[in-house]
Structure formats: structure tokens, C-alpha cells
């Protein structure tokens, strides 16, 4: 029962995470225009991966997209790839893991195949999660040392020199939105791991059962049956005896509320 | 077509408030924030500020703090100005404006400010 | 506030003639964001509203004449207009459309002779 709920939870918590994960992925604001240095712009902008906006005094925002591929900073094309790999990562991870999932049954499914399911979906969400948080804080690393370099006033213009303040970037809601995720996926992925332990057969150890067979006093003790990890194995310890005890396998074998969705 | 109707010209007592409104109508109200400007007879633009109409979040020209409060209906796609503690300073005639780039104002609401 | 100095207050030209209206920021307009300066042009007809001309400094409205050209850069900025005529009579203002409160220009009145 705590093994189902575990491995259940474990879910639940990298579903939310990936869609997490996911959600700040496509969000625009991984950096904002910090308005410390200019707090009553009219014009406010910010930026995700694949866009820029700006929004004007009409309330109006306007999207470019970033058309180059290899005009783009590397550290952003990094921070891509990290952000693709853990949904990828994630995705499949919750493919498997729903049919790893030990309240839903699929044919005669041992629980070994779903014990090692269950390890492969918790390895990736483990995976997808630290994906997540190292595109997060290599995006918030450039962040920082962007904002520090930016110098307060820069001279530009057109035939002679003129005042700008430059537009400085700080964290965007998409970063906190990024490392949550990740960490929701992480924690999800070491329940899936936890819940994995559980599931997985072990050497079972029967409570030894005395016999007095006529003149000699022998005491059977059943328990060399090792538990075979492998798909499609018979892993079920079987009944040595007719009066012996049965196996905690066999106790849970009977349908439960737990065996349909 | 994109309009901003605005409602009539006031005369009204110094001390006394008045409210005007300005209906929208051909774009999605809540899409666009709603300007004012004032400008007395003769001169240039002021700008009094905002009113965001999806939220109803203002912004307003520190000089006219307490002066203009911004509203919003949205289920008349209206905004409405009010004015309180009318001097002749105020008399001028109301802008409301919207649209990106402010590309649309109404008609202007004159607003006479006389004993 | 950001300052929006126009020149000159007024201008008497004859019909035909190019105009050139002058209008400085006492602080740069352009937004590093998407490199564009927050600058609009309005025309306004006596007892009418002003109407928009040009915004970015230099992108005309839709329906507006080519005659009208709007040009310049962070803290100044040019409205031209080419070949003027009768019904360009009016006030043409500047506005900062990039910080807060956002401010016009005294105008240039525009007169024909």
C-alpha cells in the first residue's frame, strides 16, 4: 500500500514538474527589464528563449521572434538544448512510468517489469529535473554577470554623442517557475526510485514450519527461492506445502481496489 | 471602425466634481489601455495617465494625483474620468485615447470651470 | 520628466514648399529592446483632435500621406514635409512615448501664406 502510494505520488509530483518544466520553457519572461534605474518607462521589456517582447504605453505587447539560429549567444542555445532534453526526458520518463504503475494492470505484467520501469521513469525524471535546473541557472548565471557588466550609461546615437540608459535584464517569472519544476520533477523521480525498491521482489523468508514426521523429529525451512529481476520471469514463490504459509506476494494476488484504474 | 465616443461638453461651479465618460467601440476594450490628455484652450498637451480597463490597474501624472480618478466598466467598454475640487485651472477640453500608438482619440469632452 | 523642446513655435510657408519641424528630448528615447525610438508625430486641425502621423520617429500611419517624413534619433528628432498643402494648415506635435508621465511638445503651428 505505501509502495503504491509512493510510486503514485512520485507521479503526480513529475507530472506537475514537467508540465512545469515545459510551461517555462515556452514563458517569455525568463529576464525582465529591471526598473531599478528606471522605474517609470512606458516601454518595458523582456525576453524568453525563443522571443522578445515589449510592451508599450498602449498596453500593447509586441513579440519578435529570434529568426537566426547562429546569430543566437551559445549559453542560450545551451540553456535550449538543457530545457528540450529534460521535456523529452520527462516525457517519455511518464510513458513509462504510467505503465509502471503498480494500481494499473496490463496483461500478466510481473512486478519485477514494473519494479524496473518504475527505477527507468524515476532515473529519467531525475534526469529531466536536473536538466531543467541546470538550463534554469545557466540562463540566471548570464543574467548576473550581463547585469554587473552592463554599464549605467552608454553613448550611441546618430552624428553626436547621446545619454542612454541601458536597458538592464534581471530574473523573469519563467526562472522560478524553471527551478520549481525542476525540483518537483527531481523529487518525483527519487519517489519513483524509493517506490522502486518496494516493488522489487526479494528473497522471501518464510517462518519455519515444524513437521514430526513418525520417529524422526525434521523441521523443513523453505526460503532458497531467489527472486529473478529479469521481464517475464515467474517470480512468484510457490507453495512447497499445502498448509504452509503463503508468500507476501500471494497474499496481494487476490483483485484489489488498487489493481483497476 | 474603431471609436471612442466621449460624452458632452460640461459647465459646472469651481469646488464642484464632474465625470466624464468615453465609450469604446470596433476593438476589444480590454486589449488596449485608455490614455487621458488634457488641453486647455490655445496650448499644448498634458498627459493625466492611464487606466489598464483588464484590471483596472492606473497610472497617473504625479500633478494630477488627486485631482483625476480613472475608471472602468468593462461590460459597457466605457472609462471614465472623474474630477474633483474643479478650479478655472481646470477648465480644458478632455481627451481619452487608445489603441497602439494612440491612434485613435474622441472627440474631446470641453469642461468650463465658471461661478 | 523627460523635457520635448519643439522649433520653431510657428511657420508660414507657401503651398509647394518643403517644411522642416525640429523636436528634442532632454533624454534618449530609443529602447535598447527592440532598438526603437519612442517618438510619435500628431496633427492637430483647429477644433479637431490630433490625429497620429508618425510613431517610431520615422514609421508613417497607415492613410497618412508620403509627404510626411519622420526622421532623427535618440534626443532629436525631424518631422518633413515635402511638397506642403492647404490642408496640412494645423499644430504638429512631438510626444515622448517612452517614460513616464509621458510629455508633447508645445507644438509648431503651421501657417500658409
Known amino acids: 500500500m505505501a509502495v503504491t502510494a509512493c510510486q503514485g505520488l512520485g507521479f503526480v509530483v513529475s507530472l506537475i514538474g514537467i508540465a512545469g518544466i515545459i510551461a517555462a520553457t515556452c514563458m517569455d519572461q525568463w529576464s525582465t527589464q529591471d526598473l531599478y534605474n528606471n522605474p517609470v518607462t512606458a516601454v518595458f521589456n523582456y525576453q524568453g528563449l525563443w522571443r522578445s517582447c515589449v510592451r508599450e504605453s498602449s498596453g500593447f505587447t509586441e513579440c519578435r521572434g529570434y529568426f537566426t539560429l547562429l546569430g543566437l549567444p551559445a549559453m542560450l542555445q545551451a540553456v535550449r538544448a538543457l530545457m528540450i532534453v529534460g521535456i523529452v526526458l520527462g516525457a517519455i520518463g511518464l510513458l513509462v512510468s504510467i505503465f509502471a504503475l503498480k494500481c494499473i494492470r496490463i496483461g500478466s505484467m510481473e512486478d519485477s517489469a514494473k519494479a524496473n520501469m518504475t527505477l527507468t521513469s524515476g532515473i529519467m525524471f531525475i534526469v529531466s529535473g536536473l536538466c531543467a535546473i541546470a538550463g534554469v541557472s545557466v540562463f540566471a548565471n548570464m543574467l548576473v554577470t550581463n547585469f554587473w557588466m552592463s554599464t549605467a550609461n552608454m553613448y550611441t546615437g546618430m552624428g553626436g554623442m547621446v545619454q542612454t540608459v541601458q536597458t538592464r535584464y534581471t530574473f523573469g517569472a519563467a526562472l522560478f517557475v524553471g527551478w520549481v519544476a525542476g525540483g518537483l520533477t527531481l523529487i518525483g523521480g527519487v519517489m519513483m526510485c524509493i517506490a522502486c525498491r518496494g516493488l522489487a521482489p526479494e528473497e522471501t523468508n518464510y517462518k519455519a514450519v515444524s513437521y514430526h514426521a513418525s520417529g524422526h523429529s525434521v523441521a523443513y525451512k523453505p526460503g532458497g527461492f531467489k527472486a529473478s529481476t529479469g521481464f517475464g520471469s515467474n517470480t512468484k514463490n510457490k507453495k512447497i506445502y499445502d498448509g504452509g504459509a503463503r508468500t507476501e506476494d500471494e497474499v496481494q494476488s487476490y483483485p484489489s481496489k488498487h489493481d483497476y484504474v | 471602425e474603431v471609436q471612442l465616443q466621449q460624452s458632452g461638453p460640461e459647465l459646472v461651479k469651481p469646488g464642484a466634481s464632474v465625470k466624464m465618460s468615453c465609450k469604446a467601440s470596433?476593438?476589444?476594450?480590454?486589449?488596449?489601455?485608455v490614455h487621458w490628455v488634457k488641453q486647455k484652450p490655445g496650448q499644448g498637451l498634458e498627459w493625466i495617465g492611464y487606466i489598464n480597463p483588464y484590471n483596472d490597474d492606473t497610472k497617473y501624472n504625479e500633478k494630477f494625483k488627486g485631482k483625476a480618478t480613472l475608471t472602468s466598466d468593462k461590460s459597457s467598454s466605457t472609462a471614465y474620468m472623474d474630477l474633483s475640487s474643479l478650479t478655472s485651472e481646470d477648465s480644458a477640453v478632455y481627451y481619452c485615447?487608445?489603441?497602439?500608438?494612440?491612434?485613435?482619440w474622441g472627440q474631446g469632452t470641453l469642461v468650463t470651470v465658471s461661478a | 520628466d523627460i523635457v520635448m523642446t519643439q522649433s520653431p513655435s510657428s511657420l508660414t510657408v507657401t503651398a509647394g514648399e518643403k517644411v522642416t519641424m525640429s523636436c528634442k528630448s532632454s533624454q534618449s528615447l530609443l529602447n535598447s529592446g527592440n532598438q526603437k525610438n519612442y517618438l510619435t508625430w500628431y496633427q492637430q486641425k483647429p477644433g479637431q483632435a490630433p490625429k497620429l502621423l508618425i510613431y517610431?520617429?520615422?514609421t508613417r500611419e497607415s492613410g497618412v500621406p508620403d509627404r510626411f517624413i519622420g526622421s532623427g534619433s535618440g534626443t532629436d528628432f525631424t518631422l518633413t514635409i515635402s511638397h506642403v498643402q492647404a490642408e496640412d494648415l494645423a499644430v504638429y506635435f512631438c510626444?515622448?512615448?517612452?517614460?513616464?508621465?509621458?510629455?508633447f511638445g508645445a507644438g509648431t503651428n503651421l501657417e500658409l501664406k
Open positions: 510626444q515622448n512615448d517612452y517614460s513616464y508621465p509621458l510629455t
Open positions: 485615447l487608445s489603441l497602439r500608438f494612440f491612434a485613435y
Open positions: 470596433g476593438y476589444t476594450f480590454t486589449n488596449y489601455f
Open positions: 517610431w520617429a520615422s
